[in-house]
Amino acid sequence: IVLRPSRVHNSEENTMRALTLKDILNGTFSYKTFFPNWISGQEYLHQSADNNIVLYNIETGQSYTILSNRTMKSVNASNYGLSPDRQFVYLESDYSKLWRYSYTATYYIYDLSNGEFVRGNELPRPIQYLCWSPVGSKLAYVYQNNIYLKQRPGDPPFQITFNGRENKIFNGIPDWVYEEEMLATKYALWWSPNGKFLAYAEFNDTDIPVIAYSYYGDEQYPRTINIPYPKAGAKNPVVRIFIIDTTYPAYVGPQEVPVPAMIASSDYYFSWLTWVTDERVCLQWLKRVQNVSVLSICDFREDWQTWDCPKTQEHIEESRTGWAGGFFVSTPVFSYDAISYYKIFSDKDGYKHIHYIKDTVENAIQITSGKWEAINIFRVTQDSLFYSSNEFEEYPGRRNIYRISIGSYPPSKKCVTCHLRKERCQYYTASFSDYAKYYALVCYGPGIPISTLHDGRTDQEIKILEENKELENALKNIQLPKEEIKKLEVDEITLWYKMILPPQFDRSKKYPLLIQVYGGPCSQSVRSVFAVNWISYLASKEGMVIALVDGRGTAFQGDKLLYAVYRKLGVYEVEDQITAVRKFIEMGFIDEKRIAIWGWSYGGYVSSLALASGTGLFKCGIAVAPVSSWEYYASVYTERFMGLPTKDDNLEHYKNSTVMARAEYFRNVDYLLIHGTADDNVHFQNSAQIAKALVNAQVDFQAMWYSDQNHGLSGLSTNHLYTHMTHFLKQCFSLSD
């Protein structure tokens, strides 16, 4: 019997099924990545499937359990940290989330040499942050907004700060706005390379206005959550940086690091701290009007026991076309001479590239160049610099890892990842061991993600760490949508888009279109990554076409596109989504009577404005946790892009760019507005004001709130949310349930 290929194909089609919403909500098709927890040049730790903490030595090929799952289980540990001298492990349990990065936890210290937990002088609970020194086993931790130091885990603690107060003074941890919009960490303390000094930030929130919202809980009366949260134009936190000698902490106590004069003359931010050596530190400062950044290199003065920051070691970075940096101002990566450094900033053509700064920024040597952008510097060794960029084949939504040989002249460049698994892998990140002896590559797509281990000298692949075989097998009988990444050229603007098409897509047919938008400054939605998510389901099962478009204001395509939205948020981002929709209609397979748009957070703002654009293009749309007025959002983020909401600055555009101002225009669209009542980030206030404006304009709309849920709408709310949005879209598109 000879089976014809078509017969085989048909029988395969019969056994294959579309994605279901349940698949998505259950995380059936989620993938795994493998990031080694490096502890030396050739060793890493990894938590095995049975929860043992295993140490792997790449060179000997040996591995052994350093911490038993019995020990992990005895304290219900969900995380661990090995001390650099390998004598102790902290075990983290009772994880309690606070904001995006911050959480509190209980910490136990296990003594690996004695095979038991450390008793005596135990850590208080709950702790806000805890970390080992980079050498030995000193501990620094933050408890009740104060910093403590232990020379050894069993020793009594030395209290470094005493002024910590809830919602008032934060030592060693950021307040809300610094955590979310500046540092993007849960900590604000930094050990020097050999653990001699400990630097920390103190944030004074005494004068910051407080956002208050109800948390309903289960009690008779709701609780009120109070967060010092500076909205645009409001009073900001006051920051100071201190450094203490951890060997003799009581000797002179914490020493404040001076702020550069040109920064201190008006409101300012501290943006990051980088230790260079044990006695040299680099601080970055930013004016409140965020187009001037100063990098200050400070040295320890042994005679005075103080930190000196000479003006000759101040490096200014200024933007004349937008704000300083991309989303954040980039951080320096110092070279072995401990004074020169590599840093990413805009070149004369307006593309973010790696520069080498030896004396002044003006004399910086450009290391990379082209109409693409360097995105991250991973590691600088004596002879190599490893970085990521979107250069390869001119796709801005890709990430490849490159090596530049800085030890030779002229420096030569090699793409480490471009040709490894070209179809499967076009979006990489990397994790390097000490001295870049080895590294792990984590490929996020577009194919199924894969993590591999490589030799840092030869770039040879040593082994596969995680290849998601189970996922690959599970997807064999699933009809996944087709994805394509292409670009539109409109009025000298390049609009990259990703289109997700139903499995049996036929260009001669008409399909409903859903635009998924984020569109925030320095974001990127069109990326060559693997995902099986809600929009995959909508294409696979419900036959929708989904499109994501990166318009003006988005990242990694040069400053012209990025800074186009400077001081006028809510204009071009919306225009570009509308322009793209018109182009998609011209392609001939879109049913122009069934077009929707949805977005979350900034995307909720853009989708709301698009719906209220008066174009008649959109039948319906959804806004999840949208910003509705920039006066309601955080100062650090908002002012970066919009300036201040004052008459002599940019108040007019603050007022013009609200969703409420366009309430009348929602009359001819179906609008679903969704928000969590305990959103600490984009406050419920935003949606409350949209709803009020719509009611006042007598415009009908649909709404859903999620009680006690934050900006992420997690847990059971996620299931409810996506089920609810699915029903809404199917109704809008007249699809049977």
């Epitope: 140490l55 052994y64 359990t65 350093i66 038993s68 019995r70 020990t71 005895s74 304290v75 390998r86 004598q87 136990y108 003594d111 690996l112 040499s113 004695n114 095979g115 038991e116 937990f117 450390v118 008793r119 005596g120 002088n121 069993g154």
Partner: antibody
Framework: QVQLVQSGAEVKKPGASVKVSCKTS????????IHWVRQSPGQRLEWMGG????????NYNQKFKGRVTITRDKSSSTAYMELSSLRSEDTAVYYC?????????????????WGQGTLVTVSS | DIVMTQTPLSLPVTVGEPASISCKSS????????????LAWYLQKPGQSPQLLIY???TRESGVPDRFSGSGSGTDFTLKISRVEAEDVGIYYC?????????FGGGTKVEIK
């Protein structure tokens, strides 16, 4: 049965080093840490340090730090204690003892089996 | 470091009579999380290595006669021998294993009168 058998008596000159071995049998070597305790004439028992056979990580009494080195050989289930820069006051009987590893948070164990002791005499 | 103080230094006893040794620690050996005292008693018979008698202040090691009992909590501990036998002679040591460095008492020499 459980046994901890130590190497024989040693006579050393001041400034020299001594290495005492402790060969274990009758139990799983990696389930117990090995500790070294010395007893000088007329002095109390003094804990010098210990080692976890699983990972080979030692822990030393600060008093001896820099002079004592504790190692282990997993393949022969043997622990070693080396004391350097010997002086006359190091003349003592040196014992090895085992102590069960405490995996659980509520555990903690005493030294349940001891070696027979090794007399080290430091004399010029 | 935790200092362990034993009394008496020497204890002459009569066979068949009870005996009691005291041990005090410079800080509490009671672990609040499990309500256990991290204290052990050892006996070192003449010419022999120490042998474990009691751990967790009051738990007898297997094979140890029931005439030996330990009591106390926090910083004050006692080892009792209900009826001393000739084979009980030797030096008795208390030891804390609450925290490092592990420390021993100075010892109590029990001898027959």
């Amino acid at each position: 049965q459980v046994q901890l058998v130590q190497s024989g008596a040693e006579v050393k000159k001041p400034g020299a080093s001594v290495k005492v071995s402790c060969k274990t049998s009758g139990y799983t070597f990696t389930e117990y840490t090995i500790h070294w305790v010395r007893q000088s004439p007329g002095q109390r028992l003094e804990w010098m340090g210990g080692i976890n056979p699983n990972n080979g990580i030692p822990n030393y009494n600060q008093k001896f730090k820099g002079r004592v080195t504790i190692t282990r050989d997993k393949s022969s289930s043997t622990a070693y204690m080396e004391l350097s820069s010997l002086r006359s006051e190091d003349t003592a009987v040196y014992y090895c003892a085992r102590r069960r590893i405490a995996y659980g948070y509520d555990e903690g164990h005493a030294m349940d089996y001891w070696g027979q002791g090794t007399l080290v005499t430091v004399s010029s | 470091d935790i200092v362990m103080t034993q009394t008496p230094l020497s204890l002459p006893v009569t066979v068949g009579e009870p005996a009691s040794i005291s041990c005090k620690s410079s800080q509490s050996l009671l672990y609040s999380r499990n309500q256990k005292n991290y204290l052990a008693w050892y006996l070192q018979k003449p010419g022999q290595s120490p042998q474990l008698l009691i751990y967790w202040a009051s738990t007898r090691e297997s094979g140890v006669p029931d005439r030996f009992s330990g009591s106390g909590s926090g910083t004050d501990f006692t080892l009792k021998i209900s009826r001393v036998e000739a084979e009980d002679v030797g030096i008795y040591y208390c030891q804390q294993y609450f925290s490092y460095p592990l420390t021993f008492g100075g010892g109590t020499k029990v001898e027959i009168k």
